[in-house]
Interface confidence: low
């Protein structure tokens, strides 16, 4: 059978039928349904939602829908012993206590099981001491404090503002600086956009609002007790002392009303510059400790959260492929939320639900995709990407042999300005081509393509006339598929205007105020942005699963490899003398990139010209495309990060959310001037260059003619 016969209708018609079936009204309805109660990982409510989704996906027409469970380490506040922070006087009396909960939004006052704000996986502890304000608690912030200002955080409780980097990195940095506790807070400068009202009158964060979130440094390990292996019934579990990525000091998040009370008394050193000052009416003194009259007062944390092994549930739906059932295209997003999940994750889950419904309609009319599509509703993403990682660990042998692509589907919106895409370079062309076919939902771009509005609003910094596509970092469920297994991955959502809105994430992120009404009233009343995201995500899945030749372009990889090689070389060249002294050369890497570029071009030519009706040749070429991403995996992983195995991309060691290119070399070069043994340090740079060179060259060889 030809491909078109196997899939009944012409591919173009299929795609149109699929996209036309997607309805904004359905997404709205699903979002409402998914956001009426909290769905915290490990709770009965989230299990019930899993069963509901399973039932509905079956009704939609998937071939099978299964629940897969794992018993993983989760973390919860103690219900009878709340977490809080105090200011204590010299007698040890608590003269100020932070709030124990967020004031619930109107209409939700009687909802039970709203978990109070906490930092998941914080150890228990009651440290007390002087406060040090550490800005965003980034690596560079601690450098400024320790090296320039000579401020020692050892034995101090540090207070850091949320934003810029993943909160787990902040905690790790504080630990390394010797802090005994960490207070995280949302500064209005980062979480209150000018000219917008606080929720419920607008989409800004009220003073009592607090961002929840995990503070792990898992580095891709999944369940902290079963790194590398699924947390199933027979799994060997590490003891808590050996668990991966757990913080060693108490951590707690607060809102800016409470932060004001802590920061207004700060004394000690003045902030080094304006980049350290937020928008509160406080001096933003660094400390340590309080000023003048308040110098005898201390800060005390009271953290009583517990970590416990808890059952979680993924929902895995299958739509079997007609021609290549052993090739998997995966669409996955999480289901668990911190509270109502109005944006994170249910704006994504509602889109996945509608995509499944549309695929199911086509199937009921007799159509099947060429390749198998797997749909996943992941659990415990908020606790460290646990559901997706455990499932991938359990199915790693199948995935590394059969995994074509993974499309992530967390929050569909983080704003309503323009599209935001992060993906493997292999998918650049797919995204560009797809967005050219879709209509822009943006005001002022009626009748124009999504590609056009996206390019206009978010131009590529390197390539004029093209939209920006960013590197994949982490902090979401694609991590295990891309960073560990080397499966081509991508994500898309609608975002804010990064030029004018300097706040980090969206203001109500991970707060109790992330409700259905937030979305319906302020972000997307017509659900047109949700629909567009459904079209992008669904369209990508459709093409990846149904196109005869995989819609990957290896040449785009060649382009970025060159860019990344230039970038890392430039970083290294900040140390010209040392490069000379230690004979550090990037020649081999540039040579490998050049080879890759050549081979990729030749491959693309063969791809264009080969006989597509020859099933063996077709499969052979598609396998070369599928396995290209896999070829960038180093089985030994990155130094001290064994589950980050992609040599070209890894989450930044300083910010999990951000992607870093040639991470092995980058980390070896980072702060190299401060290393005790320069010879050893530059030796490691050379080793990392050789690994990168080998990997690029090896990947290139996979694209060579097979015989």
């Amino acid at each position: 059978k030809s491909s078109s016969e196997a899939t009944n209708i012409t591919p173009k018609h299929n795609m149109k039928a699929f996209l036309d079936e997607l309805k904004a009204e359905n997404i709205k309805k699903f979002l409402h349904n998914f956001t009426q109660i909290p769905h915290l990982a490990g709770t009965e409510q989230n299990f019930q939602l899993a069963k509901q989704i399973q039932s509905q996906w079956k009704e939609f027409g998937l071939d099978s829908v299964e629940l897969t469970h794992y018993d993983v380490l989760l973390s919860y506040p103690n219900k009878t012993h709340p977490n809080y922070i105090s200011i204590i006087n010299e007698d040890g009396n608590e003269i100020f206590n932070t709030s124990l909960f967020e004031p619930p939004p109107a209409g939700y006052e009687n909802v039970s099981d709203i978990v109070p704000p906490f930092s998941a996986f914080s150890p228990q502890g009651m440290p007390e001491g002087d406060l040090v304000y550490v800005n965003y608690a980034r690596t560079e912030d601690f450098f400024k404090l320790e090296r320039d200002m000579k401020i020692n955080c050892s034995g101090k409780i540090v207070i850091a503002r949320y934003g810029k980097v993943f909160r787990g990195n902040k905690v790790k940095n504080a630990q390394l600086a010797g802090a005994t506790g960490v207070i995280l807070y949302s500064d209005p400068d980062d979480y209150f956009a000018p000219g917008v009202k606080s929720y419920p009158d607008g989409w800004n964060l009220p003073g009592g609002g607090v961002q929840r979130g995990n503070i792990l440094n898992l580095n891709g390990a999944g369940d902290p007790l079963t790194p590398g292996y699924p947390a199933n019934e027979y799994a060997y579990r590490r003891g808590m002392a050996e668990a991966v990525g757990l913080p060693s000091i108490p951590v707690h998040p607060i809102g800016y009303y409470d932060a004001q009370k802590l920061l207004e008394k700060m004394g000690g050193s003045a902030s080094p510059d304006s980049s350290w000052r937020g928008s509160l009416k406080v001096p933003y003194n660094v400390g340590p400790g309080f000023t003048g009259n308040f110098s005898t007062q201390k800060v005390k944390m009271h953290i009583h959260s517990t970590s416990e092994v808890t059952r979680i549930y993924n929902v895995i739906g299958t739509l079997r492929g007609a021609v290549e059932p052993d090739r998997y295209v995966i669409l996955g997003g999480h289901r668990d939320s911190w509270v109502f999940g109005g944006i994170d994750p249910q704006s994504g889950a509602a889109v996945v639900h509608e995509i499944v419904r549309s695929f199911g309609m086509l199937k009921k009319e007799g159509w099947r995709p060429r390749r198998t599509i797997l749909f996943a509703s992941w659990d415990a993403e908020e606790f460290g990407l646990l559901g997706s990682t455990e499932w991938a660990e359990e199915n790693s042998r199948l995935l590394q042999e059969r995994g074509v692509a993974y499309i992530n589907a967390d929050s569909s919106i983080e704003g309503n300005y323009t599209l935001r895409v992060d993906c493997t370079p292999l998918m650049y062309s797919l995204v560009y081509n797809l967005t050219k076919e879709l209509e822009s939902p943006d005001e002022g771009f009626e009748g124009k393509s999504l590609y056009e509005s996206w390019t206009k609003k978010s131009p590529s910094p390197e390539f004029s006339g093209m939209p920006r596509i960013s590197k994949l970092g982490s902090g979401n469920d694609f991590e295990v598929f891309f960073q560990r297994l080397g499966i081509a991955s991508g994500r898309a959502r609608y975002t804010k205007n990064w030029e004018t809105n300097k706040f980090s994430s969206y203001p109500l992120y991970h707060s109790v105020y992330e409700t259905y009404e937030l979305v319906e009233k302020f972000y997307d009343p017509m659900f047109k942005y949700h629909l567009t995201v459904a079209q992008v995500r669904g369209g990508m899945v459709f093409e990846l699963a149904n196109s005869v030749v995989l819609p990957f372009d290896c040449r785009d990889y060649a382009v970025v490899l060159r860019k990344y090689a230039d970038k890392i070389y430039n970083i290294s060249m900040k140390h010209p003398q040392e490069m000379k002294t230690y004979s550090v050369s990037f020649d081999s890497l540039f040579s490998a990139v050049k080879n890759f570029t050549e081979i990729a071009s030749k491959f693309s030519e063969r791809l264009r010209d080969f006989d597509k009706s020859n099933p063996i040749l077709l499969r052979m070429m598609n396998d070369q495309l599928m396995f290209l991403e896999r070829a960038f995996i180093d089985p030994l992983g990155l130094p001290d990060r064994p589950f980050y195995r992609h040599v070209i991309y890894a989450p930044s060691s300083h910010n999990k959310y951000a992607g870093e290119s040639f991470p092995g070399i980058y980390d070896a070069l980072f702060d190299i001037e401060s290393k005790v043994d320069p010879s050893q340090a530059w030796g490691e740079v050379k080793r990392q260059i050789s690994i990168a060179t080998f990997t690029v060259q090896a990947a290139a060889e996979t694209l060579s003619e097979v015989a």
Partner: antibody
Framework: EVQLVESGGGLVQPGGSLRLSCAAS????????MSWVRQAPGKGLEWVSA????????YYADSVKGRFTISRDNSKNTLYLQMNSLRAEDSAVYYC??????????????WGQGTLVTVSS | QSVLTQPPSVSAAPGQKVTISCSGS????????VSWYQQLPGTAPKLLIY???KRPSGIPDRFSGSKSGTSATLGITGLQTGDEADYYC???????????FGTGTKVTVLG
């Protein structure tokens, strides 16, 4: 009102076995770690074992490791202590205690009245 | 063999103050919270102090707790005959992964 009621104590020969039970009420049993604490006649308190809320992770004092097994049935709100290879030094009043915080023994805010175990030939 | 050391006994006249010390190490008292229990003759222990210095509801403010370094102290002011009991400190030991109690202190009210 929180109540913990132990049962199952009695006289047993050295090398023998005994299973203690603790029926709990007045609180969400599955949410809390539970412990067994014993007190030999005229002696001080000795923590024996604990089981975490939810996960059922278990912890034991070195003196009973390999001989005693703690377990819980959340559906029955009951804590158990299976005691095997009993020795004379295991003779004590065994108290069931509820943890005040959660997963590992932290402090015991409620105690049962105790059940006496005598190991003697 | 208890890893937390308490004086075997303390005594004072009614209305007086007594303090009971509890000495441990960095792996227990040093980095964990201390609780105190009162055991009246022939009864089960009762929680007196938790989190080093907090009193459960119903415990009079004559009882106080404190912690410094690897030692903790229980204070009883305005001693009453009803305070005659055994008192135990307790905490988690991070090295042993076990809960540990002190050796116990018998409080006697003189006269």
């Amino acid at each position: 009102e929180v109540q913990l009621v132990e049962s199952g104590g009695g006289l047993v020969q050295p090398g023998g076995s005994l299973r203690l039970s603790c029926a709990a009420s007045g609180f969400t049993f599955s949410s809390y770690a539970m412990s067994w604490v014993r007190q030999a006649p005229g002696k001080g308190l000795e923590w024996v074992s604990a089981i975490s809320g939810g996960s059922g992770s278990t912890y034991y004092a070195d003196s009973v490791k390999g001989r005693f097994t703690i377990s819980r049935d959340n559906s029955k709100n009951t804590l158990y202590l299976q005691m095997n290879s009993l020795r004379a030094e295991d003779s004590a009043v065994y108290y069931c205690a509820k943890d005040g915080v959660g997963a590992t023994p932290y402090y015991f805010d409620y105690w049962g009245q105790g059940t006496l175990v005598t190991v003697s030939s | 063999q208890s890893v937390l050391t308490q004086p075997p006994s303390v005594s004072a006249a009614p209305g007086q103050k007594v303090t009971i010390s509890c000495s441990g190490s960095s792996s227990n008292i040093g980095n964990n919270y201390v609780s105190w229990y009162q055991q009246l003759p022939g009864t089960a222990p009762k929680l007196l102090i938790y989190d080093n210095n907090k009193r459960p509801s119903g415990i009079p403010d004559r009882f106080s707790g404190s912690k410094s370094g690897t030692s903790a102290t229980l204070g009883i002011t305005g001693l009453q005959t009803g305070d005659e009991a055994d008192y135990y400190c307790g905490t988690w030991d991070s090295s042993l992964s076990a809960y540990v109690f002190g050796t116990g202190t018998k409080v006697t009210v003189l006269g």
